[in-house]
Interface confidence: low
């Protein structure tokens, strides 16, 4: 019967013929009377056999990224009568793995959006690195994940790439980073490949800012000829934060008088003073009112932010009219 | 507003290491990434590397085993020591600020001629 | 030899149009890492003219635009003006060399 063991080559192999192993009938005495045949694919382009011996030999590098195993059918002649000495046999030569693949990102680039203000812990998104190595074959396929950029506002899960917030962050003051992450080959040991990826990482808004007016006080004019419903000036608060976040809302905090109204324009969020009932000079030729502003929409949990709505001082002066 | 500023001897011999440092005023060095960029008279800008405020570096391959770029966030610095020096390192050294992927502020630069 | 590819200089008319390129590869822009523009004045710094491709930051006026595609990125200047006269500098992220790369520069004179 045939003899043989397993049949293993390393891939890139650079040596010009690499000794695989030995094919052999138990017949064979040794004294060159048997012929050895190699056929299949890649027989006798990237594998030869020594025809008197049965040893195999690879010849050409192999990569086994590109193919893992060859199946290839060996044949034993006796010379003398041409005869098969025992039947064709297949066998199977095995490519065997070694770490000359870096880690590669393949759904780059990588962007996510998380709130702004969210607590550590917070799941940013996950990175995932995939490395053509046989994973079977020892670490040269075991990746480990680091940090490279990106502290101390984030960190990595060394084993899942599972990216995460480590500080709280304040859109208002940075509103987008780029975390660079690192997949190591081997876990991490002497002779690991390596690959990097960028990952950019927006803050959404929360509303975590209160409007605030630009002034502590404002002066305003009103004639006493003025109808009711007249507008007699605008005052303006700015919030830090964005869109739906940063819409206010104005009102009069304090008017003994009850002469004066004011309305909010939420095109330019602006607050219209309005002359709610007509003045009179001669009566009274000045007024002060406080107006407070407010967000629109706050979040019960973000209510912490809002204590104290702000308010700002309106002197108005009337202007006296010559009455016939 | 912040502003960099670049200092360090402007001539260096063949075979010594150039040291520069860059003072950030107007603003923390933490949270950002810090880069120093260099152009030979005449020439292109060529990125050498940057630092992270905690400390993380990356250089530019070509430059690596020559290049150290480290932080004092105490004084608000970030320095670069580049060693083996050749008449090829002459050029006008920039230090700047990394937002996202590109440098929003920069030094005014400072020229560093290397000859003996 | 720069990884980024620039036409070493562009001209026009005050008044004109033109158009600055950077060509990349797979492993910068066509990656979809964002490109980046820099003006550089004779005797002074870089100044970041675009970013993001097509941002531009306050105090840059509406006549200089960026725009992205595949590997390449251009650079637009219209009713050009003397002190456009300048180094221009692409710049982007090239993810094989872990790093910043930038082109070698466009010099563009105003006839």
């Known amino acids: 019967g045939w003899v043989w063991n397993q049949f293993f080559v390393p891939e890139e192999m650079n040596t010009t013929s690499h000794h695989i192993g030995q094919l052999r009938s138990d017949l064979d005495n040794g004294n060159n009377s048997f012929q050895y045949k190699l056929l299949g694919a890649g027989a006798g382009s990237t594998f030869i056999i020594d025809e008197r011996t049965g040893d195999i030999y690879a010849i050409q590098k192999l990569d086994r990224e590109e193919r893992s195993l060859y199946i290839l059918r060996a044949q034993v002649i006796d010379i003398a009568t041409g005869r098969a000495v025992e039947p064709e046999s297949e066998f199977v030569i095995k490519v065997s793995d070694i770490n000359d693949n870096e880690p590669k990102f393949l759904d780059e680039p990588y962007e996510a959006i998380v709130p702004e203000m969210s607590p550590e812990g917070t799941l940013v998104i996950q990175v995932t690195a995939s490395d053509a190595d046989d994973p079977s074959s020892g670490n040269n396929a075991r990746l480990l994940y680091s940090l490279l950029q990106g502290q101390p506002y984030f960190s990595v899960e060394p084993t899942t790439g599972v990216i995460r917030i480590s500080s709280k962050m304040d859109r208002e003051l940075q509103d987008e980073y780029w975390v660079i992450i690192q997949a190591k080959d081997m876990i991490g040991q002497p002779g690991a490949l390596s690959g990097t990826t960028s990952v950019l990482i927006k803050l959404s808004d929360v509303n975590d800012n209160k409007p605030i007016f630009k002034e502590s006080l404002y002066r305003l004019t009103v004639s006493e000829s003025a109808p009711t419903g007249t507008s007699i000036g605008t005052i303006m608060a700015y919030d830090n934060d964005i869109g739906e976040n940063a819409e206010m809302d104005y009102s009069i905090e304090e008017d003994d008088s009850q002469t004066f109204d004011i309305i909010t324009n939420h095109e330019t969020q602006e607050g219209i003073v309005i002359l709610k009932k007509k003045v009179d000079f001669e009566h009274q030729n000045h007024y002060g009112i406080r107006a407070k502003v407010k967000n629109h929409h706050v979040p019960e949990q973000l209510m912490k932010y809002h204590t104290e709505a702000s308010t700002t001082f309106i002197k108005i002066q009337v202007e006296d009219v010559d009455e016939p | 507003q912040v502003q960099l500023q670049e200092s360090g001897p402007g001539l260096v011999k063949p075979s010594e290491t150039l040291s520069l440092t860059c003072t950030v005023s107007?603003?923390?060095?933490?949270?950002?990434?810090w880069s120093w960029i260099r152009q030979p008279p005449g020439k292109g800008l060529e990125w050498i590397g940057y630092?992270?405020?905690?400390?993380?570096?990356n250089y530019n391959p070509s430059l690596k085993s020559r290049v150290t770029i480290s932080l004092d966030t105490s004084k608000n610095q970030f320095s670069l020591k580049l060693s083996s020096v050749t008449a090829a390192d002459t050029a006008v050294y920039y230090c700047?600020?990394?937002?996202?992927?590109?440098?929003?502020?920069w030094g005014q630069g400072t020229l560093v001629t290397v000859s003996s | 030899q720069s990884v980024l590819t620039q036409p070493p200089s562009v001209s026009g008319a005050p008044g004109q149009r033109v158009t600055i390129s950077c060509t990349g590869s797979?492993?910068?822009?066509?990656?979809?890492?964002?490109v980046h523009w820099y003006q550089q004045l004779p005797g002074t710094a870089p100044k970041l003219l675009i970013h993001g491709n097509s941002n531009r930051p306050s105090g840059v006026p509406d006549r200089f635009s960026g725009s992205k595609s595949g590997t390449s990125a251009s650079l637009a200047i219209t009713g050009l003006q003397a002190e456009d006269e300048a180094d221009y500098y692409c710049?982007?992220?090239?993810?094989?060399?872990?790093?910043?790369?930038f082109g070698g520069g466009t010099r563009l004179t105003v006839l």
């Open positions: 700047a600020r990394n937002w996202a992927f590109h440098f929003d502020y």
């Open positions: 710049q982007s992220y090239d993810s094989s060399l872990s790093g910043w790369v």
């Open positions: 107007g603003g923390s060095i933490s949270s950002y990434s």
């Open positions: 630092i992270y405020y905690s400390g993380s570096t």
């Open positions: 797979s492993s910068n822009i066509g990656t979809g890492y964002d």
